[in-house]
């Protein structure tokens, strides 16, 4: 019985040109992590293996940075990197849980609106 | 003005599908997601998910992931969403509802479209 | 996914009354760089629902300023002061922070 839950970093608004950290952590479960998918649509993005360790997908090398932990830093944002991005968490013996983000990156001339953007 | 101006009221037969429009103006299309809503009984609200024009991209809650399918056609700036399989929970009123920037939620409602599901 | 529960259900007022509309999340609605995505919204009948504040406590253009937001994490609520004719239909909050998006139940505000 899959008992485990996923917490996010919860929905995030972003600057172009800036960088965010997507995050997730899986709770409430004894069952051991084997390895962590990050997927936007359905483009993966990256791996973090247990042990193999991490992997990035060749077409996001220059753009996306593994860690802080599982977690994943996108960086230089454009406004095509909006949308669903997805933790996959693959567990031994649970199987399957899935965390979803979703990022809006917003152009500059926005900030006129009084949104405020999240630059770490 | 913003205006988001959808088709007009359904009846359809059960397990038969359909499509809603919703045809957008005043703003820049691409430049705002498209999300839309269901609401039951007169009173529920349920978020089905959104699409994103300016690259196509999608979300949607997972209960209506086998239900609806959300598309735009960028040259007529207009946002559609099918829905299939329809049975009697699928009667309810449709929104459309242009995403505020920064802040997930929607600033701008189109009128609603009525969908009945009966034989 | 996030419930968002609502109350009171109904809300029997009169003109000029204050009133105040809570909104609860079953978890903090606050994401890791500290933005909140809570909004609320009125529905009148026959109309199509209207933005009245997002993100907790921002009111929307056109608002007027007898409507407040304030809360923060789990607890929200929204004032109406001096309720006038115009304010009668149905509130609800949203929840952005989480996916999928999840709006509370619906406080119905009619005339006692």
């Known amino acids: 019985m899959m008992t485990g839950t996923i917490e996010t970093t919860g929905n995030i608004s972003a600057e172009k040109g800036g960088s965010i950290i997507l995050q997730c952590h899986l709770s409430s479960t004894t069952a051991q992590v084997t390895q962590v998918n990050w997927e936007q649509q359905d483009q993966l993005l990256a791996i973090c293996n247990a042990d193999l360790g991490w992997h990035i997908s060749p077409s996001f090398k220059d753009r996306v940075a593994p860690g802080p932990g599982l977690g994943l830093t996108l960086q230089s944002l454009t406004v095509n990197d909006t949308g669903e991005y997805f933790c996959i968490y693959h567990t031994y013996p649970d199987g399957t849980y899935t965390g979803r983000i979703f990022l809006e990156v917003l152009e500059s001339s926005v900030a006129e609106h009084g949104a405020r953007f999240q630059i770490p | 003005e913003v205006q988001l101006q959808q088709s007009g009221p359904e009846l359809v037969k059960p397990g038969a599908s359909m499509k809603i429009s919703c045809k957008a103006s005043g703003y820049s299309f691409t430049g705002y997601t498209m999300n839309w809503v269901k609401q039951s009984h007169g009173k529920n609200l349920e978020w089905i998910g959104l699409i994103i024009p300016y690259n196509g991209g999608t979300s949607y809650n997972q209960k209506f992931k086998d239900k609806a399918t959300l598309t735009i056609d960028k040259s007529s700036s207009t946002a559609y969403m099918e829905l299939l399989s329809l049975t009697s929970e699928d009667s309810a009123v449709y929104y459309c509802?242009?995403?505020?920037?920064?802040?997930?939620?929607?600033?701008?409602w189109g009128q609603g479209t009525s969908v009945t599901v009966s034989s | 996914d996030v419930v968002v529960t609502q109350t009171p259900l109904s809300l029997p007022v009169s003109f000029g009354d204050q009133v105040s509309i809570s909104c609860r999340s079953s978890?903090?609605?606050?994401?890791?760089?500290?933005?909140?995505?809570l909004s609320w919204y009125l529905h009148k009948p026959g109309q199509s629902p209207q933005l009245l504040i997002y993100?907790?406590?921002n009111r929307f253009s056109g608002v007027p300023d007898r409507f407040s937001g304030s809360g923060s994490g789990t607890n929200f609520t929204l004032k109406i002061s001096t309720i006038k004719p115009e304010d009668l239909g149905m509130y609800y909050c949203l929840q952005g922070t989480h996916q999928p998006w999840t709006f509370g139940g619906g406080t119905k505000l009619e005339i006692k």
């Open positions: 509802a242009r995403g505020f920037r920064g802040y997930f939620a929607v600033d701008y």
């Open positions: 993100g907790i406590s």
């Open positions: 978890q903090s609605l606050t994401n890791s760089y500290g933005n909140t995505y």
